[in-house]
Amino acid sequence: EEELQVIQPEKSVSVAAGDSATLNCTVSSLIPVGPIQWFRGAGPGRELIYNLKEGHFPRVTAVSDPTKRNNMDFSIRISNITPADAGTYYCVKFRKGSPDVELKSGAGTELSVRAKPSAPVVSGPAVRATAEHTVSFTCESHGFSPRDITLKWFKNGNELSDVQTNVDPAGKSVSYSIRSTARVLLTRRDVHSQVICEVAHVTLQGDPLRGTANLSEAIRVPPFLEVTQQSMRADNQVNVTCQVTKFYPQRLQLTWLENGNVSRTEMASALPENKDGTYNWTSWLLVNVSAHRDDVKLTCQVEHDGQPAVNKSFSVKVSA
């Protein structure tokens, strides 16, 4: 009698994550009587994938009706494939007994899973930094296979070069992750700037995935202060202005001091935005000169975004 053959015609099968995979297996003879089982891997640590007789295998179905008389097709379909399903699958014939005895295994079919990278997530520094400082942005994407991937950073469309990228794990795995850090030098004009992390992979239909971060979340542009006096009014009052310009973010508190004593405190709110994303604010203080015998020292004190206060002083001359 001819020796039983267990035929797995495909050496390898590749599928996209989320799809179904069909693993083909036929036997050359109905005898000896005994079941077919599917395993992933070989040797003592192999994992049972499908056993017609018992067990609950929710994602695995038989392609043909295995209970049908004279059935020699023991192909299976695994639905909703994930990268974790990758491996070599063996169709194994057993001889019926107590217990069943393994008789012959197919040559195995390697299942390869291609999976798309997740949308890149870009995170910036925890605290704001001022212009001329360098900040780091991190981009992460996960779950892709195969391992080959390209990641590029752009600031306002220009590719960044101060970049460090790692793909993990280094060895063979069912899926991979990428993590990249880009160092970006901030300028005062960066409030409206954007960094983009662009990930390209074989599974993407020609269009890279992009993650973005706005530099407005990472930058602090400290204000310029200028205190000036308007001409004396007829009622002996002097109008002194404090111009606070080119600052970001808007969070700003301004305090007027007359000879070191707090005269008034104001909070910036609902300011119009400059073209470059920064803000300007002007505060006025009326000083009654006739109420003073000596010159008045006026100080405009600005506390911006929780930073130490910045002062600009001005002396109003009181004529004898």
Partner: antibody
């Protein structure tokens, strides 16, 4: 799933010509599509692709002479400043469902002859 | 750009012969290699993708192997319908560009 090229004809050197690839059975917004050519008796040559969102990418030799664009059911190849060496059969093809590294569906091709 | 060198450029074989065609990339393309069959006046047909995966509907006598820079297409037992020209095609994941080998013509001995 089918691809059919059209627009191939005899063209004069220095003129322009637009080839079209009409698709059926799938959406152009889901796949990368490519243009290739084959001069008589020669091998296959890659011209360029257009991504699912409509971004074109070209072989380095194209140098701006060819432009790939698409609508919902057709992909076009506009060829400017035709030369005799552009004489070839032009094929359009679709990448496979698993990735952009291979082309599993091809059109039958359309012949372009450039001669004065 | 990556260069793909295919060899031999032509070969003569008989029905039933085992035929091997090789393709070498000028730099590593990992496993991003496809093989196509083309008959005169026809469009190419995909045989193998990702270096070793048989495309659906392609007879199992065709097989592919290799990774990195060296790849092989094997026809285990040549059939009359297999007389054609075979091309390898690479995809480079960094440049995202495609390159073909110059082709191998398989003729009847």
């Amino acid at each position: 799933v089918q691809l059919v090229e059209s627009g191939g004809r005899l063209g004069q050197p220095g003129t322009s010509l637009t080839l079209s690839c009409t698709v059926s059975g799938f959406s152009l917004s889901s796949y990368v599509m490519g243009w290739f050519r084959q001069a008589p008796g020669k091998g296959l040559e890659y011209i360029g692709i257009i991504s699912s969102s409509g971004s074109p990418y070209y072989a380095s030799w194209v140098n701006g002479r060819f432009t790939i664009s698409k609508t919902s059911t057709t992909m076009d190849l506009k060829m400017n400043s035709l030369r005799s060496e552009d004489t070839a059969t032009y094929f359009c093809a679709r990448v496979g469902p698993l990735g952009v590294d291979y082309f599993n569906i091809w059109g039958p091709g359309t012949l372009v002859t450039v001669s004065s | 750009d990556i260069q793909m060198t295919q060899s031999p450029s032509s070969l003569s074989a008989s029905v039933g012969d085992r035929v091997t065609i090789t393709c070498r990339a000028s730099q590593s393309i990992n496993s991003y290699l496809a093989w196509y069959q083309q008959k005169p006046g026809k469009a190419p047909k995909l045989l193998i993708y990702s270096a070793s995966f048989l495309y659906s509907g392609v007879p199992s006598r065709f097989s592919g192997s290799g990774s990195g820079t060296d790849f092989t297409l094997t026809i285990s037992s040549l059939q009359p319908e297999d007389f054609a020209t075979y091309y390898c095609q690479s995809w480079h994941y960094i440049s995202r560009s495609y390159t073909f080998g110059q082709g191998t013509k398989v003729e009847i001995k």
